[in-house]
Amino acid sequence: SEVEYRAEVGQNAYLPCFYTPAAPGNLVPVCWGKGACPVFECGNVVLRTDERDVNYWTSRYWLNGDFRKGDVSLTIENVTLADSGIYCCRIQIPGIMNDEKFNLKLVIKPAKVTPAPTRQRDFTAAFPRMLTTRGHGPAETQTLGSLPDINLTQISTLANELRDSRLANDLRDSGATIRIG
C-alpha cells in the first residue's frame, strides 16, 4: 500500500525527511524539488541547504525543524490543489552516486467546508465528498475562507476526519530517515 501525505487546501503541508549528521554541525547539502528525483540534483527546486545554512528557498516553502540536527522536513504554507504531486528530498552525500533520494507523495484535499466558494470551474454537477466539492476549481482560487460553526450535517464526517488525522500523525512519525557516518 502506498505511503502518502495529505493536507487540506489552506492548511500547511508537512513532508518528513531526516538524516543524522556524522558530527554536530557537520551538515550535508539537501535539496527539495517538485517532481520525482532525477538522477542528479532536484528538478524544479523549491528549497536548498548547503553545509551551513538554507541558501535558497521560494515563497511558501520552508524548513520548520532544526535542519542543523538533520531535520530537513519541508513545510509548504497555505497549500492549494496545485501543490498535489511528488516531491523529492535529496540528501547530497559527498562522493559519486552516494545521494539518498526520497520521493514523497502529497495529496491536497479540498477544504471540508467551503462557504460561498470563490470562482471555481465546472462546479454545477460536482458532488460532495467529505463535505467538499471535488476540486475542479482553479487551485489558486480554492480558498478556505472563514469556517461556520459545526452543524449536524458535518457530524457524519467526524470518523473520516479522525481517520485522516491519525494517518497524518502515523506518517509524520514514519518519515524518510537516514544515518550518515
Partner: antibody
C-alpha cells in the same frame, strides 16, 4: 503497489449492453474516485466519467451522457461501467484509471478492455 | 470543453535526436497539463504532470514546459524504447481532455 485489473474483451451485437469491471488493489478503494476513458481505433482518448466509491457520487461527460452507467462495490474494491444500446461507434478500448487524488491526472491505469460492436 | 491541439501528428527521428512535441489549449489552463506515453496495445503511462513535473520512475530525458495555452514536451535524446504515441491532457477542468497524439518513430 496500486493495480487496476479489468475484465476481458467483449464482442457484442448492436443494441446490446456490456458491463466492464475494474478491480482495484494496493490502496484504500474509497479514498479515490475511479475514472473511465475510452479510445476508439485511431482516435484520441476520451474521458467518460468518474465514480466516488466512498459515496457513489458520479459525474459523466455531458457529450456522451446516457451511454455509460458507473457503479462500484466497496466490498470487492471493484468499479463497473455498463454500456447500453451499443452501436458500432462504441467499438473502442475502455480504460479505468485512478487519479492522484482530487487532481485529474492519472498515474494508474487498467490494462484496457476491448469492446467490439459488430452485427 | 477545452480542446487540446497537438502537433505534429507524427514524426520520425534518429536515435539520440532531440524530439519536441507541442500542445495548444483552446483556453488558459495555467500549468495544468499532463503528458502520457502509449505503446501499441498498452494503457497510457503518465510521464509529466502540472506541465513540468516528472512522475516517479520517468527518465530524466523526458521534460515538459509551458503555461497558459502553449506547452512543450521534449525527449532530449531519443532512445529505441521511446517509440510510442504521446498525448497531452489538460487537468484544469472537467471533462479532462486529451490531444490527438503524436506518433514518434525511428528513422
Amino acid at each position: 503497489e496500486v493495480q487496476l485489473v479489468q475484465s476481458g474483451a467483449e464482442v457484442k451485437k448492436p443494441g446490446a449492453s456490456v458491463k466492464v469491471s475494474c478491480k482495484a488493489s494496493g490502496y484504500t478503494f474509497t479514498n479515490y474516485v475511479m475514472h473511465w476513458m475510452r479510445q476508439a481505433p485511431g482516435q484520441r482518448l476520451e474521458w467518460i466519467g468518474y465514480i466516488d466509491p466512498d459515496n457513489d457520487g458520479i459525474k459523466y461527460n455531458e457529450k456522451i451522457k446516457g451511454k455509460a452507467t458507473l457503479t462500484s462495490d466497496k466490498s470487492s474494491s471493484t468499479a463497473y461501467m455498463e454500456l447500453s444500446s451499443l452501436r458500432s461507434e462504441d467499438t473502442a478500448v475502455y480504460y479505468c484509471a485512478r487519479d492522484f487524488g482530487y487532481v485529474d491526472w492519472f498515474p494508474y491505469w487498467g490494462q484496457g478492455t476491448t469492446v467490439t460492436v459488430s452485427s | 470543453d477545452i480542446v487540446m491541439t497537438q502537433s505534429p501528428s507524427s514524426l520520425s527521428a534518429s536515435v539520440g535526436d532531440r524530439v519536441t512535441i507541442t500542445c495548444k489549449a483552446s483556453q488558459d489552463v495555467t500549468t495544468a497539463v499532463a503528458w502520457y506515453q502509449q505503446k501499441p496495445g498498452k494503457a497510457p503511462k503518465l510521464l509529466i504532470y502540472s506541465a513540468s513535473n516528472r512522475y516517479i520512475g520517468v527518465p530524466d530525458r523526458f521534460t515538459g514546459s509551458g503555461s497558459g495555452t502553449d506547452f512543450t514536451f521534449t525527449i532530449s535524446s531519443l532512445q529505441p524504447e521511446d517509440i510510442a504515441t504521446y498525448y497531452c491532457q489538460q487537468h484544469y477542468s472537467i471533462p479532462p481532455t486529451f490531444g490527438g497524439g503524436t506518433k514518434v518513430e525511428i528513422k
